[in-house]
Interface confidence: low
């Protein structure tokens, strides 16, 4: 969106000015600007910041907007993720397999076959848990085969995600304890896909991926991450730069415009028919008539 003021020109203030286009911008920023007429060919070659010309307009990457994708957005949507994950670090002892040095080598055929069997067994064990995603073996060691592995869980994001995952981790503990108690070697014979040592089952650690708006904001802002912050309104996080109006960190550029660049937010001051404006926040007005007489 381009706003035109017939009698207003913009002039850069000292050092590195960066400007956010529209002082009343909202989190939703237009990503495209249509161009008609003879100048369009020229515009096509000038799309900035990774923008691409589609024949009519510059299509801008997420962080940018404007006719030439020259403007950095002042607000980034950091709505909650679709899913939240949890990882349980577990150790079980498999007694039905003899340990060999080859099992230490994750690219060996022995390891691959063991991994396939173990994964298949765990898929059966955890089959009733909707949040179960799979297992990931991290290490195999001697004694018969001590399997250090992660059980991966995932659930759709809801405000209750923590309770859902907490419940799932409890069910995982119950099921692995049950199977390692039931599937055991009898007279050195294993009648199941895998057998376990009842006393070799341990849960070391449970990690639930936290929904971290600050981290999401920093990542999505990429090289501008140092200047974007998260502020909350009605418990909803907003990832904003100081160029977004209406927040506690908002930069007041008075009659000027705030613009973001690699080196941070700065005010771009305007010149009207009657005044020049200057200063870090464009708060110093000089009447032209006083200069020109």
């Amino acid at each position: 969106r381009t706003t035109s003021f017939p009698t207003v020109t913009t002039t850069a203030v000292p050092t590195n000015t960066t400007i956010k286009s529209n002082p009343t911008s909202t989190p939703t920023v237009p990503r495209t600007t249509t161009c008609f007429g003879d100048g369009c060919q020229n515009t096509a070659s000038r799309c900035k910041n990774g923008g691409t010309w589609d024949g009519l307009k510059c299509q801008c990457p997420n962080l940018y907007y404007g006719e030439l994708c020259e403007e950095v957005v002042s607000s980034i949507d950091i709505g909650p993720p679709e899913t939240i994950s949890a990882q349980m670090e577990l150790t079980v002892t498999v007694t039905s397999v003899k340990f060999t040095e080859e099992l230490k080598n994750h690219s060996s055929q022995e390891f691959q076959e063991f991994k396939q069997t173990f994964t298949e067994q765990m898929n059966i064990v955890y089959s009733g848990i909707p949040e179960y995603v799979g297992v990931n073996i991290t290490k195999l060691r001697l004694g018969s085969v001590v399997v250090e592995h992660d059980v991966l869980l995932r659930t759709k994001y809801t405000p209750e995600y923590k309770t859902v995952l907490d419940n799932a981790t409890e069910v995982v503990k119950e099921k692995i304890t049950k199977v390692t108690t039931q599937q055991i070697m009898i007279n050195d014979i294993c009648s199941d896909m895998m057998c376990f040592n009842t006393t070799g089952t341990q849960v070391q650690n449970i990690t639930v991926t936290q929904y971290d708006p600050e981290e999401d904001c920093r990542k999505m802002a990429k090289e501008y991450g140092d200047y974007f912050v998260v502020e909350y309104r009605d418990q909803k996080p907003y990832c904003i730069s100081p160029c977004e109006p209406g927040f506690s960190v908002s930069k007041n550029c008075n009659l000027g415009k705030c613009q973001m660049s690699l080196s941070g937010p700065q005010c771009l001051c305007v010149t009207t028919e009657t005044h020049w404006y200057s200063g870090e926040t464009c708060n110093q007005g000089t009447q032209k008539s006083l200069v020109y007489g």
């Epitope: 590195n16 990774g50 990457p61 090289e223 140092d226 690699l262």
Partner: antibody, heavy 120, light 113 residues
Framework: QVQLVQSGAEVKKPGASVKVSCKAS????????MHWVRQAPGQGLEWIGM????????RLNQKFKDRATLTVDKSTSTAYMELSSLRSEDTAVYYC?????????????WGQGTLVTVSA | DIVMTQSPDSLAVSLGERATINCKSS????????????LAWYQQKPGQSPKLLIY???TRESGVPDRFSGSGSGTDFTLTISSLQAEDVAVYYC?????????FGAGTKLELR
Amino acid sequence: QVQLVQSGAEVKKPGASVKVSCKASGYSFTIYWMHWVRQAPGQGLEWIGMSHPSDSESRLNQKFKDRATLTVDKSTSTAYMELSSLRSEDTAVYYCSRPYYGSSAWFADWGQGTLVTVSA
Amino acid sequence: DIVMTQSPDSLAVSLGERATINCKSSQSLLNSSNQKNYLAWYQQKPGQSPKLLIYFASTRESGVPDRFSGSGSGTDFTLTISSLQAEDVAVYYCQQHYSFPLTFGAGTKLELR
């Protein structure tokens, strides 16, 4: 420990293309931009551009806009720089470099360099 | 584009003496919001990749000896090696990390006298 390992030296004829690879390890590949810088024999350093592994967005120095293509393969943590329509003045050592944490603009880690020779 | 001009092109200094390399930018690299200057210095030895020494004009990279220091503000910057060691013989480059495209100085070759 961060490591950027580049592909081997190349000899190309004028007009041809070259694709240099840079395999990253020792850090979270998708958080950092990957930059490319070149250095002609006995000359200074020249920034070509950068790409971001999370979404493959790339940013090029205008000088290389029409000839350089930067890509990434997240599955192998490898970045690529392809330069087309080669000319003799493209003879240089090409470096991939990783920026310092929290910045995309100065370089904490560098690949060992790939010498590209353009000669008829 | 911001043009970076280094001087001198080459410099010969005796062991233990002070070496001073200058770098001038065509526009200010000072960010008035945080009062940081967006300039870095690199060292490149023959046949090696560049090595980061200093960023933000004066912040020494971890592991860099304290005989290396950076100073300056706005458009004029200096890299100083307080007491030259034999291993400091190299080419030194300044680089602005203020705006794209990122640009480097042409380099200063530091030799032993």
